[in-house]
């Protein structure tokens, strides 16, 4: 009951983890900036890892889509990928998962193969987290060490004067959304992990000794008695006695260092 | 390499008018605030005009009802239609533009133009 507590809460929560990484990567709010050396006070700019905006107290909001690709710095082009793989990682962990899910019933798919499809799925889905959290990382970096207050250098450019436009960066909502979601994604794949040493059957076998009696022939059949799982050929956990209805060879066992007691 | 060209300065009589335009061209990603600064000669450089890209405007208080500015977003240029001109406008009119660039959408410069001599006398 535990483990199937356990297994459920994982995905639940990687299924969450998922959608909010999904969204952080749709964002337009990955850094917020305000232009405050401008006479236009209420002009607002965000950017995402798509498209750039500007906002204005007027209620005007323009976006642009970055349409170059080779162009663009190759730090966002990385985060790009770092998020993109993550919400690949995190759908095929989903869709294993589900089919892994102690409470869903596939054919007579064993417990030790939903216990393998559960481990695969944890395992995704921490790489899935891992990877938003390091995109969202390397972005949030990208914006302290580069930008988090651009000074106003003046240089002569080609048409005249040059100024960095005195900008202060700011974290926009969809870092903070990554980093939730990464980290719900990383503890989702860490519970079906432990999930899945639950579901893993324990192949524990006790093995049987064949005893020659006398009398009538009684023969205990190695895997008689097995861990209580359920698991391996004799269900049921009982001791097999056949009676003497077999032929020569089956009644012949092996000699072993019991068989003269 | 972005540049903001600036025309139509010239010599005009007081109570005259005027157009300026000012382009910008280069590898632009997109032009956030575009305005006019002037300087007269012994002076400091001032705000005359500016507008967004939603077109809200501010003006200097001197140019208030006698200057007009607008922008052509596709174009990347902005325009200012100056009538009523006085004496004391006279100056080198620059063009100003806060953009970013195609190569680094994250980053805002503010270009300048290399200014266009506006002369009001009689």
């Known amino acids: 009951m535990a483990v199937t507590a356990c297994q459920g809460l994982g995905f639940v929560v990687s299924l969450i983890g998922i959608a909010g990484i999904i969204a952080a990567t749709c964002m337009d709010q990955w850094s917020t900036q305000d232009l405050y050396n401008n006479p236009v006070t209420a002009v607002f700019n965000y950017q995402g890892l798509w498209r750039s905006c500007v906002r204005e107290s007027s209620g005007f909001t323009e976006c642009r889509g970055y349409f170059t690709l080779l162009g663009l710095p190759a730090m966002l082009q990385a985060v790009r990928a770092l998020m993109i793989v993550g919400i690949v990682l995190g759908a095929i962990g989903l869709l294993v998962s589900i089919f892994a899910l102690k409470c869903i019933r596939i054919g007579s798919m064993e417990d030790s193969a939903k216990a393998n499809m559960t481990l695969t799925s944890g395992i995704m889905f921490i790489v899935s987290g891992l990877c938003a959290i390091a995109g969202v990382s390397v972005f949030a970096n990208m914006l302290v060490t580069n930008f988090w207050m651009s000074t106003a250098n003046m240089y002569t450019g080609m048409g005249g004067m040059v100024q960095t436009v005195q900008t202060r960066y700011t974290f926009g909502a969809a870092l903070f959304v990554g980093w939730v979601a990464g980290g719900l994604t990383l503890i989702g794949g860490v519970m079906m992990c432990i999930a899945c040493r639950g579901l893993a059957p324990e192949e524990t076998n006790y093995k049987a000794v064949s005893y020659h009696a006398s009398g009538h022939s009684v023969a205990y059949k190695p895997g008689g008695f097995k861990a209580s799982t359920g698991f391996g050929s004799n269900t049921k956990n009982k001791k097999i006695y056949d009676g003497g209805a077999r032929t020569e060879d089956e009644v012949q066992s092996y000699p072993s260092k019991h068989d003269y007691v | 390499q972005v540049q903001l060209v600036e025309s139509g300065g010239g010599l005009v009589q007081p109570g005259g008018s005027l157009r300026l335009s000012c382009a910008a061209s280069g590898s632009i990603f997109m032009i956030n605030v575009m305005g006019w600064y002037r300087q007269a000669p012994g002076k400091q450089r001032e705000l005359v005009a500016v507008?967004?890209?939603?077109?809200?405007?501010n003006y200097a208080d001197s140019v208030k009802g006698r200057f007009t500015i607008s922008r052509d977003n596709a174009k990347n240029t902005v325009y200012l239609q100056m009538n009523s001109l006085k004496p004391e406008d006279t100056a080198v009119y620059y063009c100003?533009?806060?953009?970013?660039?195609?190569?680094?959408?994250?980053?805002?410069?503010?270009?300048w133009g290399q200014g266009t001599l506006v002369t009001v006398s009689s």
């Open positions: 507008i967004t890209r939603g077109a809200s405007t």
């Open positions: 100003n533009a806060d953009l970013n660039l195609a190569s680094d959408p994250f980053k805002w410069y503010t270009y």
